[in-house]
């Protein structure tokens, strides 16, 4: 039960137990038969951080601007300068004697953790669902476009690097091809017209023509069936081109309701 | 120099509590523990514990478990002594003392080398 | 705990005179033993520690001796400020117990 070393905060010297220097304190002459231990506070510019039996305090840590450090907590005389490193840029060791820029997540990885004054990006592979298609330091990965919700459907897959590429489902490209076919139809249909206005002003045998002027021809509401002797060409199905059969009425293709 | 100064004396209805303060000056506080000692008038010296002035932690003679507690003040170096549920015979002289430790021959001598003047504490209804 | 008995309890001498007192422990305490002497109204003073090594700024007249259960305090020649009273403490086992105590008084 007696003790079997000296007490926590004491230090065995010359068969004493003298008490150790509080943290802030160096240690100016041990304790004797005859007197205390003797410490001294440390100066403006040191630090001693611990109980202790040292006879120099330590100097402060010096925050190099030069090396992107800055300070972060003031000394005192029992803690030691706190250095961090400017916005953009992170320590590179636990002591934080220099700095480096911040790491950027490159296309097909977003930021996990962002980067501070100590510790560096953490990125991560964007996982199935997600993509980034830029180089940052900020960036999370960002979930795909979601077609359903805007009454599209996917026409390109999306990767760890695009996003998603949505295209009209097939009733609304319906909508789209449908008129685009019947603009082209039309188009067709006026070099026709051209067409049969010059082949009319040819002199023919079949059929006589008691004035040399030019005949004026009409046509009824569903075109073009008015001149059976001619075929004429329509854009019917997929707007491929096809020949109209003679003896045939010609029809235009009306989607079907549903 | 060292010295441990101690509270004025206290005069307690039994069944009343008294703490009685040490204040020490002269040496690092934390860096000894410090002793409570009590003397009966015209009696011998009764050991009532210790307590560890860094870390706060007590250690009481069995005869005084559940009564006495002993706390510190590091910030104002002082130690302090509770004792609880007082009765006539707790009247004493209450003493603080420092404990010192010699190294030899390969073992830690303690022993109370500085001692607070004393508090005279009367239990009487 | 450790009973520590001191003799004599009480002691009559003269200046000049040769004193031993002497303390026993009812179990061995190695060299765990010290001295203290305490004067009418003020608090004791380490005289010895490590049952012989003498207390800084303590006359050397006093000196202490002894091990294991039987330990002596001895004044080699009494002087008018030595007349008080003297208490040994083991410091072996807790609780930290004194002896009864020896008086010193003048013849």
């Known amino acids: 039960e007696p003790p079997t070393a000296c007490r926590e905060k004491q230090y065995l010297i010359n068969s004493q137990c003298c008490s150790l220097c509080q943290p802030g304190q160096k240690l100016v002459s041990d304790c004797t038969e005859f007197t205390e231990t003797e410490c001294l506070p440390c100066s403006e510019s040191e630090f001693l951080d611990t109980w202790n039996r040292e006879t120099r305090c330590h100097q402060h840590k010096y925050c190099d601007p030069n090396l992107g450090l800055q300070v972060q907590q003031k000394g005192t005389s029992e803690t030691d300068t706190i250095c961090t490193c400017e916005e953009g840029l992170h320590c590179t060791s636990e002591s934080c004697e220099s700095c480096v820029p911040h790491r950027s997540c490159l296309p097909g990885f977003g930021v996990k953790q962002i980067a501070t004054g100590v510790s560096d990006t953490i990125c991560e592979p964007c996982p199935v669902g997600f993509f980034s298609n830029v180089s940052s330091a900020f960036e999370k990965c960002r979930p795909w476009t979601s077609c359903e919700t805007k009454d599209l459907v996917v026409q390109q897959a999306g990767t760890n690097k695009t996003d998603v590429v949505c295209g009209p489902q097939d009733r609304q490209r319906a909508l789209v091809v449908i008129p685009i076919c019947l603009g082209i139809l039309f188009v067709i249909l006026l070099l026709v017209l051209v067409f049969i206005k010059k082949v009319a002003k040819k002199p023919n045998d079949k059929v006589p023509h008691p004035k040399q002027e030019p005949q004026e021809i009409n046509f009824p509401d569903d075109l073009p069936g008015s001149n059976p002797a001619a075929p004429v060409q329509e854009t019917l199905h997929g707007c491929q081109p096809v020949t109209q059969e003679d003896g045939k009425e010609s029809r235009i293709s009306v989607q079907e309701r549903q | 120099q060292v010295q441990l100064v101690q509270s004025g004396a206290e005069v307690k209805k039994p069944g009343a509590s008294v703490k009685v303060s040490c204040k020490a000056s002269?040496?690092?506080?934390?860096?000894?523990?410090m002793y409570w000692v009590r003397q009966a008038p015209g009696q011998g010296l009764e050991w009532m514990g210790w307590?560890?002035?860094?870390?706060?932690?007590?250690t009481y003679a069995q005869k005084f478990q559940g009564r006495v507690t002993m706390t510190r003040d590091t910030s104002i170096s002082t130690a302090y002594m509770e004792l609880s549920r007082l009765r006539s015979d707790d009247t004493a002289v209450y003493y603080c003392a420092r404990e010192k430790i010699y190294y030899g021959s390969g073992n830690y001598y303690p022993s109370f080398d500085y001692w607070g003047q004393g508090t005279l504490v009367t239990v009487s209804s | 705990d450790i009973q520590l008995t001191q003799s004599p309890s009480f002691l009559s001498a003269s200046v000049g005179d040769r004193v031993t007192i002497t303390c026993r422990a009812s179990?061995?305490?190695?060299?765990?033993l010290a001295w203290y002497q305490q004067k009418p109204g003020k608090a004791p003073k380490l005289l010895i520690y490590a049952a012989s090594t003498l207390q800084s700024g303590v006359p050397s007249r006093f000196s202490g001796s002894g091990s294991g259960t039987e330990f002596t305090l001895t004044i080699s020649s009494l002087q008018p400020e030595d007349f008080a009273t003297y208490y040994c403490q083991q410091l072996w086992s807790y609780p930290w117990t004194f002896g009864q105590g020896t008086k010193v008084e003048i013849k």
């Open positions: 179990q061995g305490i190695s060299s765990y």
């Open positions: 002269g040496y690092t506080f934390a860096g000894y523990y």
């Open positions: 307590i560890n002035p860094d870390s706060g932690a007590p």
